[in-house]
């Protein structure tokens, strides 16, 4: 699952990891890009282990994965609000 | 050359506990993701359990969670799996296994096993 | 979860021979999918990563291929240490393994 939300006012991600998470483990992933009060774009992953994770956006892993998510999500219609579902 | 030994299998009844050790040598074994595969009567392979390199995060299927406990001790380059509450349906060879994901770009899953450790679960 | 459908349980084929074995996915596994050989009395080796990557020292007669749901293996000029069961396994959502694929030859 991907999702982007534009609604927090704060940062929330202390400190990011660059560490590699093989896909099989990521349960979803979260973007909250720049403004509404964080001046940086933050990336959280949910592990399938209910763990949570802040992960580097530079990080080149999270990068391929985010590109492999937009390309599976432009080929299949839109679901609403802020959420996709990707297989 | 990598080398995995299992060891600590048998016979156990309904509801008992037992615990799995395996021996890593001939790899750097704290840079390296581990993991627990069954073998089932059948001839099927199960996953089991799979521990970071680190120890910090583990997983498992449904079937096992809450059950089950996977550990590692980088120190004595050991791998450990305990199971309480055993059933029937446990009964398999248990394969320790290397799980290899170094980077995006290196991703090998399971690619080295040991020979397997047997244990039964019969009244 | 993921289920993966392997198929054929078994097959029987000659000596320099060619076999293939398919693994169907519930979902799209993005290529997310090896190939292993287990002789008994020994833990499986990995013979090919990501649907097509071949192991190091793993002869060129073995290869693998596909995409999406639908994959498979092959193994060409067989020989007699080819016996063996061969087992697919996904890594695309933790991990699943195919039923396997008892090899005889005739």
């Known amino acids: 699952v991907l999702e982007v939300y534009y609604t927090h006012l704060r940062c929330r991600c202390v400190q990011e990891s660059s560490v590699f998470i093989p896909r099989r483990f990521i349960d979803r992933i979260q973007i909250s890009p720049r403004g509404n009060g964080c001046p940086r774009k933050e990336i959280i992953v949910w592990k399938k282990n209910k763990s949570v994770v802040c992960v580097d956006p530079q990080a080149e892993w999270i990068q391929r994965i985010m590109e492999m998510l937009r390309k599976k999500s432009s080929s299949t219609p839109p679901v609403p609000v802020f959420k996709r579902k990707i297989p | 050359e990598v080398q995995l030994v299992e060891s600590g299998g048998g016979l156990v009844k309904p509801g008992g506990s037992l615990k799995l050790s395996c021996a890593a040598s001939g790899f750097t074994f704290s840079s390296y993701a581990m993991s627990w595969v069954r073998q089932t009567p059948e001839k099927r392979l199960e996953w089991v359990a799979t521990i970071s390199d680190g120890g910090s995060d583990t997983y498992y299927p449904d079937n096992v969670k809450g059950r089950f406990t996977i550990s590692r001790d980088n120190a004595k380059n050991n791998l450990y799996l305990q199971m309480s509450h055993l059933k029937s349906e446990d009964t398999a060879m248990y394969y320790c296994?290397?799980?290899?994901?170094?980077?995006?770009?290196?991703?090998?899953?399971?690619?080295?096993w040991g020979q397997g450790t047997s244990v039964t679960v019969s009244s | 979860d993921i289920q993966m459908t392997q198929s054929p349980s078994s097959l029987s084929a000659s000596l320099g021979g060619k076999v293939t074995i398919t693994c169907k996915a519930s979902q799209d596994i993005n290529k997310y999918i090896t190939w292993y050989q287990h002789k008994p009395g020994k833990g499986p080796r990995l013979l090919i990563h990501?649907?097509?990557t071949l192991q190091p020292g793993i002869p060129s007669r073995f290869s693998g291929s596909g995409s999406g749901r639908d994959y498979s293996f092959s193994i060409s000029n067989l020989e007699p240490e080819d016996i063996a069961t061969y087992y697919c396994l996904q890594y695309d959502n933790l991990y699943t393994f195919g039923g396997g694929t008892k090899l005889e030859i005739k």
């Open positions: 990501y649907t097509s």
């Open positions: 296994a290397r799980d290899y994901y170094g980077s995006s770009y290196e991703d090998y899953a399971m690619d080295y």
